[in-house]
């Protein structure tokens, strides 16, 4: 018996779910109270999922698991595994029996996008050329574990000096930090990279030094230049700081973040007290920071409705204000692919073949190509739809007319995180049915 | 101790404009952040606006952002108050003021004030 999966591994987002192709070719007059099926750990050879005796066992795998039952009879016994996790990820075979058996074992490779690096300076302050400063590269809740690369303005790689560490959370992602020490010129920027090796998705940030002093008594607010962008659901810092004069006590600190364009009060500070949120409770500030200068915000759970720009005042004796953007993004689901019609398909006939990719954010840029990758322009209709947090389901459909055979991609481009999620079908000269292997 | 002498007022028809100055003396002006407030006859003194020490931040009462531009020129230690569109209500004795500790838009953040210079709206 053959039982066919797909050469290359599937890659999942954590968090999302994943189809584990599997397809069998049934006999002639074969029912389903003849199958026997297993889905199990090709290593542990733990249980994973099973059917036999005409009936789904159901899932012995953390309940996350699923077959589709109405393609069993069709020789589809892909399995779908919900939520995945960083501890999913590994070789799954699939084994089936009927009169003849045989299996077959499918990779997960399991994945998520690092956030966008944040940077810091230590010291951050009155910077001469000649002072050694060390700019650490942060970037969080990545999978696989990351490779960073450091360059200059010139994109001249920098490669002495650099301590890079990368640490497990509980669920098995990765906090990466990266430290540069270098010696100030005149002025310099240094960018960080932060590259996912599966998902091929850089995430990058620089910082530009320019050494001087700020005038006597002037309060220098200082914010990003570039936006700050944070994953839903994850917290993000929007930095901000000021210098503070010889003498300076929190007492004499008026700190306020509020919304730029609506000048709503997200956060206070004053008469040498934290006021507390007034933004949804998802705001606090950095105390033990603040007589430093560092008047950060750190903003929970992100929503697509907090995008925009958020201003930081402070006023001591002399006052200033600067405005930080945050980018709200969210990535895309790896594309699933379906074809219409699915059965029976012979070249010269017309197929509608569909791309979706779910709750990324922003708006995602969709390409088509055939298997030589040439683009596909003609005859794509794409929608996408916000949901209620604002997070977009995107739909492509691509109408052809089919040739002896043929490969068709679709790459979901989030512009923001450049995340590329692809999905792509193969479509054989002779009579065929769609999905071959699911 | 820090001297502010202001200047400019006068009467104005409404729809007109105006600029005020205020000129400091006894100190590194450079240093101060400067404001701007104005009392109505009958009423308190409120906030117009507020400049930083070296002219790069500035803060308006919402009423005001729009028609009136602060300013500063710190080689001539001199603050300006650029006022158009000018309305009836806007008559009032104009003050200009440093900056100590506390928010721009409160009269107890500051520590000088000067006399004031009177500025009449009417047809």
């Known amino acids: 018996l053959e039982v066919q999966v797909p050469e290359d591994p599937v890659v999942a987002l954590v968090g999302t779910d994943a189809t584990l192709c599997c397809s069998f070719s049934p006999e002639p007059g074969f029912s389903l109270a003849q199958l026997n099926l297993i889905w199990q750990l090709t290593d542990t050879k733990q249980l994973v999922h099973s059917f036999a005796e005409g009936q789904d066992q159901g899932s012995a795998y953390a309940n996350r698991t699923a077959l589709f039952p109405d393609l069993l009879a069709q020789g589809n016994a892909s399995l779908r595994l919900q939520r995945v996790r960083v501890a999913d990820e590994g070789s799954f075979t699939c084994f089936v029996s009927i009169r003849d058996f045989g299996s077959a074992a499918v990779s997960l490779q399991v994945a998520a996008p690092y956030s966008k690096p944040s940077m810091t300076l230590e010291p951050n302050k009155d910077l001469r050329p000649g002072d050694t400063v060390t700019i650490t590269c942060s970037s969080y809740q990545g999978y696989p574990e990351a490779e960073v690369f450091w360059q200059d303005g010139q994109g001249v790689p920098l490669t002495g000096n650099v301590t890079t560490s990368q640490m497990a959370n509980e669920q098995g992602l990765f906090d990466v930090h990266s430290i540069l020490r270098v010696v100030l010129g005149a002025n310099g920027t240094y960018s960080c990279l932060v590259r996912n090796p599966v998902l091929q998705q850089d995430a990058h940030s620089s910082v530009t030094i320019t050494p001087q002093r700020s005038p006597t008594g002037a309060v220098e607010v200082q914010v990003p230049e570039d936006p700050v962008v944070a994953l839903v659901g994850t917290d993000a810092t929007l930095r901000c700081s000021f210098s503070p004069e010889p003498g300076f006590s929190l007492a004499q600190l008026n700190l306020i973040w509020q919304l730029t364009d609506t000048k709503q009060l997200v956060h206070s500070f004053t008469e040498g007290r934290d006021q507390g949120s007034a933004y949804a409770n998802r705001t606090a500030l950095f105390p033990d920071l603040l007589a430093q200068g560092n008047a950060s915000l750190r903003l929970q759970r992100v929503r697509v409705a907090d995008e925009g720009s958020f201003t930081c005042f402070v006023s001591i004796r002399d006052f200033g204000s600067a405005a930080v953007s945050l980018q709200v993004a969210a990535p895309y689901s790896k594309p699933s692919m379906t074809l219409e019609p699915n059965k029976d398909l012979r070249p010269g006939d017309t197929v509608t073949i569909t791309c979706s990719s779910y709750r990324g954010y922003p708006e995602a840029e969709v390409f088509w190509q055939d298997g030589q990758g040439v683009p596909l322009t003609g005859n794509v209709t794409t929608s996408q739809m916000a949901n209620e947090q604002g997070l977009f389901d995107v739909h492509s459909v691509l109408r052809v007319v089919l040739g002896a055979n043929g490969t068709y991609s679709c790459l979901v481009r989030n512009p923001v995180l450049q995340q590329d999620a692809h999905g792509s079908v193969t479509i054989t000269g002779q009579p065929m049915t769609f999905p071959p292997e699911a | 101790e820090v001297q502010l002498v202001e200047s400019g007022g006068g009467e104005v028809q409404p729809g007109g404009s105006l600029r005020l100055s205020c000129a400091a003396s006894g100190g590194t002006f450079s240093s101060y952040a400067m404001g701007w407030f104005r009392q109505a006859p009958g009423k308190e003194r409120e906030f117009v606006a507020a400049?930083?020490?070296?002219?790069?931040?500035?803060y308006y009462a919402e009423s005001m952002e729009g028609r009136f531009t602060i300013s500063r020129d710190n080689a001539k230690n001199t603050v300006y108050l650029q006022m158009s569109s000018l309305r009836a209500e806007d008559t009032a004795v104009y003050y200009c003021?440093?900056?100590?500790?506390?928010?721009?838009?409160?009269?107890?953040?500051?520590?000088?004030w000067g006399q004031g210079t009177l500025v009449t709206v009417k047809p």
């Open positions: 400049i930083s020490s070296e002219g790069g931040s500035t």
């Open positions: 003021a440093v900056k100590g500790v506390g928010w721009p838009q409160e009269q107890a953040s500051y520590d000088y």
